[in-house]
Amino acid sequence: EVEKTACPSGKKAREIDESLIFYKKWELEACVDAALLATQMDRVNAIPFTYEQLDVLKHKLDELYPQGYPESVIQHLGYLFLKMSPEDIRKWNVTSLETLKALLEVNKGHEMSPQVATLIDRFVKGRGQLDKDTLDTLTAFYPGYLCSLSPEELSSVPPSSIWAVRPQDLDTCDPRQLDVLYPKARLAFQNMNGSEYFVKIQSFLGGAPTEDLKALSQQNVSMDLATFMKLRTDAVLPLTVAEVQKLLGPHVEGLKAEERHRPVRDWILRQRQDDLDTLGLGLQG
């Protein structure tokens, strides 16, 4: 806390400008009006304030807005956002995607901080669902964002938003998350034709049940091994050797290289040796 001291004569700030960088902390506290700061927040980022000076500016805003900053201030926080705690951010009501983008830009290139996580949580909860524009924005800044959500949070993603999801956005998703996303993707892409459908659904197949895999095996999709390795173990186990051969097409030879890994290992164990021998890969059940 900065002690309350009177502003020296002639030092009262008329606007937020570069002259303020020469002010001591106590002078900033005494001479900068919080309301002026709030209306000229967009200027703060252009001025090379020290971290200590930014602390003072934050303190002034906190005093002016004890219940949380208005969005007009939040949108222009810039680097001052890095000074905010998750507790501060929980008081905010951020509704504009532009505000969200502005703040994410400040943290760009860094891992998702607790502050950013709280901001995103507040924003998404305020919107009620993870719409396509929001998802587009979040995955652009954080490709792993979708997979950082719990299955419960993912349930608020409408199928229409699935179009915004890129394969790399699903790289770190676990089976429980894909279990939620797959039915949404199936719904989103249902009107596409066979080959186009497979291209789009491929990244989500880690949540596909056995019956859908059996159906795909009848469509000459030639699934690659990387996708096959991501399938749910319980979905793969009931597949016959013939179905796996059809599903993988020319990629079936890749099973040999993965025979010690799940789910291939578990699937091999459950097959009759005679059936495995038809593949000519030397797989031992």
Epitope: D174, R176, T233, D234, L237, R260, H261, R262, G285
Partner: antibody, heavy 119, light 107 residues
Framework: QVQLQESGPGLVKPSETLSLTCTVS??????????WSWIRQPPGKGLEWIGY???????NYNPSLKSRVTISVDTSKNQFSLKLSSVTAADTAVYYC???????????WGQGTMVTVSS | DIQMTQSPSSLSASVGDRVTITCRAS??????VNWYQQKPGKAPKLLIY???SLQSGVPSRFSGSGSGTDFTLTISSLQPEDFATYYC?????????FGGGTKVEIK
């Protein structure tokens, strides 16, 4: 529910073969969804997986023990067994049998049996 | 073999604390990582399977996350009965391996 019980001698002489049996009750060793494993834990140390067997007889062993280990299954007795040859004092441990349910992990364990290798 | 490196090897914590244990695989284990709790003189108990799925009957204060090479076990609010040793284990590769264990002690 499924329960596992290890049995076998608690003392084995160096260079001899350690033999243990795990009896499965409340379930079947012939389940298609289960692998049956042996795991050991030397006193004051961590867990070491020894190997597993499937009801069909397919086995897989820890590479560091492979040359000395044999795991077998007797579906008629609902048991699976461990044989570890040429034992030394370093094989002194609590030996556990465990069920490896394919969709989870080692979800059921025996209570463990202490085997000491000493002359 | 896939080596599983657990950290820390031991930690002291108080009842009510949030505790995080990490496990790093020497190569990708996808999401085939399980977590166990072991108390002295007892067999280990499965807590989390497939990186993040809670085993039936395990309190919801236990949670797991991660995929590829980095995995985490979190106890959101440590209870007296949680003081024990915790192990991670990968089952992606046919040669199963355990982490070295993390002993959680009372501060």
């Amino acid at each position: 529910q499924v329960q596992l019980q290890e049995s076998g001698p608690g003392l084995v002489k160096p260079s001899e073969t350690l033999s243990l049996t795990c009896t499965v009750s409340g379930g079947s060793v012939s389940s298609r969804d289960d692998l049956w494993s042996w795991i050991r834990q030397p006193p004051g140390k961590g867990l070491e997986w020894i190997g597993y067997i499937y009801y069909s007889g397919s086995t897989n062993y820890n590479p560091s023990l492979k040359s000395r280990v044999t795991i077998s299954v007797d579906t008629s007795k609902n048991q699976f067994s461990l044989k570890l040859s040429s034992v030394t004092a370093a094989d002194t441990a609590v030996y556990y049998c465990a069920r490896d349910f394919v969709l989870s992990g080692f979800d059921i364990w025996g209570q463990g049996t202490m085997v000491t290798v000493s002359s | 073999d896939i080596q599983m490196t657990q950290s820390p090897s031991s930690l002291s914590a108080s009842v009510g604390d949030r505790v995080t244990i990490t496990c790093r695989a020497s190569q990708s284990s996808r999401y085939y990582v399980n977590w166990y709790q072991q108390k002295p003189g007892k067999a280990p108990k499965l807590l989390i399977y497939a990186a993040s799925s809670l085993q039936s009957g395990v309190p919801s204060r236990f949670s797991g996350s991660g995929s590829g090479t980095d995995f985490t076990l979190t106890i959101s609010s440590l209870q007296p009965e949680d003081f024990a040793t915790y192990y991670c284990q990968q089952s992606y590769d046919a040669s199963y391996t355990f982490g070295g264990g993390t002993k959680v002690e009372i501060k």
